[in-house]
Structure formats: structure tokens, C-alpha cells
């Protein structure tokens, strides 16, 4: 097996009991293939769904830093740049996974977490709902 | 767990040159308090600018699947239910972290990787380029 | 703790601009939004705009022609301009914090925290 | 506009005693997406600021007194007191935050008998 340099109070990874744990390298590497440098970055504005980013900052997590999307309206914003609500702005949500320090404040130990965010926002046609 | 073949050149951890390295604890925590079922679940119908998921699975990734969205239309539905190119639908982007098997088959051997993923589609209002 | 605190010139001469500042402390601006609110001398309550964490703003129709709030990060300060004011623009006028909720994903429209309000009277 | 209709305009009520305020809407303020009522209430005591009381119809501000709940759904909403104390008394008003522009009702006036 790998072996690392112990600090006592860190968790032993021999112990039978102890969850399954792998060794990450953290320097990232980008598979963005994509060169656009625009992407996403206006849409928040011209979307008939708009919204706005929010920084959401955590030390404990990695990446410490998660910028969440808040729908500006309930309702969508018309040809004439009015907000119509015949129609409702939601948000687009994906479920990340995140490094969350554990114990926390060790350096070097963490636990995968899921978490889910808030991406950006998209008008939809309402639900209905039939009174009988 | 998982078990995976392993190939023999999976890196020594004590090897001074070997990039940062931190064990992390794969039992996956899920913090996603959020109890409303539906989420994003029919959006991609519902939306003006609705959306195709596709399956992207890479064993070689952790998470092995990833759905990404395809926009149905150039444009965007509109009150009759017709394509409306006045107007376009757009692919909704974020930067998700994955763990890449480094080296390829190692079980226990992982580098960080940031993707580019495709989350839903919204619609916007086209920018007008004036020819001069 | 959380604090507004608003400011600016009690008297304004019809046909100019009302220009009132709100300094704010004890929350981070990059979260939260801020809107303008005025009360005439005994009526009720009228939202006036807002402006988003990203400096975004949006106006109530009413005062949409004349009206323009915003921030100056810097200074932990916003501003509200009114420009052709008459007799009908004298009212309390407060700066508001838009409540934010963590996981909740629309802006909110609620006011949980208020300036204690400035009165501004239009008069020649 | 969006239009708040509270009633009663005044209250006179005695300490201890129960008291009860309605807002109407002129249009629905549940929204579908997620079932939730757009509709506050704040007080406004005499000489000060108004502050929040209630959201979401029902939901109390943090530090707001269990004596106050707000329920109801669609236009009709209701805030109550089980037991008014003479620290309740002020201008009560309802607001909705479904449509832009965001408006308030009248205000009820509440004062001690």
C-alpha cells in the first residue's frame, strides 16, 4: 500500500474500520478545451431568465470559493423587457462534488461531499394545477 | 469498494518529486439539505429553451457519469409552441472538479481535473452585430 | 451588527434632483442587495428600486424615468437620485437591506433590516 | 400594480387579549415552482422604522415573538397575536414580494384600549 509521513493525530488508513480513502494529486489540470472566453459570462444579463452570481465562501471546503446563481424574478422578462408571470424563472441545478477538510482544518485530509448549487436560471412554462 | 487492476508503475508518495498529495476519504458526504424531489427534474421539458441530457461515462474519471445538456433548438419556444429565432437558446456552463486515475488504472491514484460541463440551456436575447 | 444609515439634504426645490446617500455596516455587500422605500407624511409604504449585489438595478415603473441608484463599494455606500422632483416626492425615504437566504435560489424581495429613515421635503 | 388591501385600518386592543389583521391581494401570491406565498408583515412602532415580523406567510423573523404567526394562501392572509402586550402596538403592514413592482398595503394601526 502507500505510505505517508503520519502526523499521530491524523486518521490511520490501516485501520480495517476506516472508510476507504485514495491519494489526490491537487495540482489541477484543465481539460477546458474550450478557448471562448465569454462562455456563460453574459448570459445571467440577456437571459429572459436572469440572475445573479453570489460568492459563496467556505476555508474548510476546496474550491473554497463557489459562486451560486439567484433567479432575479419569479416570473420571465417579455419582448418588451417587462416581467411576464404567465411564465416562471427556476433555477438550473447540479449536484458537485467538493473536497471538505476532515478533521477539520488538517491540510492534507478530506472527504469527497456533495453539494448542490445553483448554476444559472431558466423560464418555463408553469404547472398548472387543476382544482376539482 | 472499488477494485481495479493495478498498474504497476502507481506512484510512491514518498518520493520528494511527487506532486502535493492528500488522502481523501471517497465515502461520499452528502450535503444537499434541500429537500423539494422535483429540482431540476422536468425543467429540460418545461423551459423555453429546453434541453437533451446525454451520458458521458469515463471510467478513467471519478465520477465515471456526467450528463451533459444539448439545447434542443438554435432558438427558443415561444407562446405557441414554435421555434422563435428571433431569439437563442444557450448552453448553461460551469467548471465541475473530477478525479482523473493518474496513472490510468490505478485504483487508489487520483489528480484533480477541472471540466467544462453543459448543466441546461436558457434563453437570451441575441447580440446584434451592425455592419458598418 | 447590521446598520443603514441614510443621509442627505431635507430641503429640495421642486424641479431638481433629490440625491440621498445610505451608508451601510455589519454585512457584505457582495451578498446582499439594497433597495430604496419612501413613506409621504402619513400614507403607507412605496418600494421605489433596488440594486443588486453585482450592481444591477431595477426600478419600480413609477419612478422609472427619473430615478437611478448606485454603489459605491469603496465607501460601503449607496445612493438614490430623483431627478424632477415636485410637492408629491416630500416622504420619509429609507434605505433596506434585501434579505438573503442561503439555499434559496431567487433574490429576495423581503426587508430585514432598515435605515432609520430621512425625511426630504420638496418646497420652494 | 399589485394591489395590498388590509383591514381592519385601526385597531383598539386590550393587553393580553388576542388580535387579528387580513391582507388581500389583488392576485394570487403562491407560486408554483415551489409552493410558497410571497407575503411579509412588518411593524412599524411609533416614531422608528419599520421591521420585519413575518415571511413567506409564515415563516417569523429571527428574534420575532411566537406570539405572532401569519397563515393563509392565494389573496387572502392573515396575521394574529395570541396575546397582545403593550410593546405590539404600531402600524402593521402587509407586503408582497411576487411582483415587481414590490407593493405594501395601508397599514393597520394598532393601539392600546
Known amino acids: 500500500g502507500i505510505t505517508i509521513p503520519r502526523n499521530p493525530g491524523c486518521p490511520n488508513s490501516e485501520d480495517k474500520n476506516f472508510p476507504r480513502t485514495v491519494m489526490v494529486n491537487l495540482n489541477i489540470h484543465n481539460r477546458n478545451t474550450n478557448t471562448n472566453p465569454k462562455r456563460s459570462s453574459d448570459y445571467y444579463n440577456r437571459s429572459t431568465s436572469p440572475w445573479n452570481l453570489h460568492r459563496n465562501e467556505d476555508p474548510e471546503r476546496y474550491p473554497s470559493v463557489i459562486w451560486e446563481a439567484k433567479c432575479r424574478h419569479l416570473g420571465c422578462i417579455n419582448a418588451d423587457g417587462n416581467v411576464d408571470y404567465h411564465m416562471n424563472s427556476v433555477p438550473i441545478q447540479q449536484e458537485i462534488l467538493v473536497l471538505r477538510r476532515e478533521p477539520p482544518h488538517c491540510p492534507n485530509s478530506f472527504r469527497l461531499e456533495k453539494i448542490l448549487v445553483s448554476v444559472g436560471c431558466t423560464c418555463v412554462t408553469p404547472i398548472v394545477h387543476h382544482v376539482a | 469498494g472499488i477494485t481495479i487492476p493495478r498498474n504497476p508503475g502507481c506512484p510512491n508518495s514518498e518520493d520528494k518529486n511527487f506532486p502535493r498529495t492528500v488522502m481523501v476519504n471517497l465515502n461520499i458526504h452528502n450535503r444537499n439539505t434541500n429537500t423539494n424531489p422535483k429540482r431540476s427534474s422536468d425543467y429540460y421539458n418545461r423551459s423555453t429553451s429546453p434541453w437533451n441530457l446525454h451520458r458521458n461515462e469515463d471510467p478513467e474519471r471519478y465520477p465515471s457519469v456526467i450528463w451533459e445538456a444539448k439545447c434542443r433548438h438554435l432558438g427558443c419556444i415561444n407562446a405557441d409552441g414554435n421555434v422563435d429565432y428571433h431569439m437563442n437558446s444557450v448552453p448553461i456552463q460551469q467548471e465541475i472538479l473530477v478525479l482523473r486515475r493518474e496513472p490510468p488504472h490505478c485504483p487508489n491514484s487520483f489528480r484533480l481535473e477541472k471540466i467544462l460541463v453543459s448543466v441546461g440551456c436558457t434563453c437570451v436575447t441575441p447580440i446584434v452585430h451592425h455592419v458598418a | 451588527q447590521v446598520q443603514l444609515q441614510e443621509s442627505g439634504p431635507g430641503l429640495v426645490k421642486p424641479s431638481e434632483t433629490l440625491s440621498l446617500t445610505c451608508t451601510v455596516s455589519g454585512f457584505s455587500l457582495p451578498s446582499h442587495s439594497v433597495s430604496w422605500i419612501r413613506q409621504p407624511p402619513g400614507k403607507g409604504l412605496e418600494w421605489i428600486g433596488i440594486?443588486?449585489?453585482?450592481?444591477?438595478?431595477d426600478y419600480n415603473s413609477a419612478f422609472k424615468s427619473r430615478v437611478t441608484i448606485s454603489v459605491d463599494t469603496s465607501k460601503n455606500q449607496f445612493s438614490l437620485k430623483l431627478s424632477s422632483v415636485t410637492a408629491a416626492d416630500t416622504a420619509v425615504y429609507y434605505c433596506?437591506?434585501?434579505?438573503?437566504?442561503?439555499?434559496?435560489?431567487?433574490?429576495?424581495?423581503?426587508?430585514?433590516?432598515w435605515g432609520q429613515g430621512t425625511l426630504v421635503t420638496v418646497s420652494s | 400594480d399589485i394591489v395590498m388591501t388590509q383591514s381592519p385600518l385601526s385597531l383598539p386592543v386590550t393587553p393580553g387579549e388576542p388580535a387579528s389583521i387580513s391582507c388581500k391581494s389583488s392576485q394570487s401570491l403562491l407560486f408554483s415552482e415551489n409552493q410558497k406565498n410571497y407575503l411579509a408583515w412588518y411593524l412599524q412602532k411609533p416614531g422608528q422604522s419599520p421591521q420585519l415580523l413575518i415571511y413567506w406567510t409564515s415563516t417569523r423573523q429571527s428574534g420575532v415573538p411566537d406570539r405572532f404567526s401569519g397563515s393563509g394562501s392565494g389573496t387572502d392572509f392573515t396575521l394574529k397575536i395570541s396575546r397582545v402586550e403593550a410593546e405590539d402596538v404600531g402600524v402593521y403592514y402587509c407586503?408582497?414580494?411576487?411582483?415587481?413592482?414590490?407593493?405594501f398595503g395601508q397599514g393597520t394601526k394598532v393601539e392600546i384600549k
Open positions: 440594486i443588486w449585489n453585482n450592481g444591477g438595478t
Open positions: 407586503q408582497q414580494s411576487y411582483y415587481t413592482p414590490y407593493t
Open positions: 433596506a437591506r434585501n434579505m438573503y437566504i442561503t439555499d434559496y435560489y431567487y433574490e429576495n424581495y423581503f426587508f430585514d433590516a
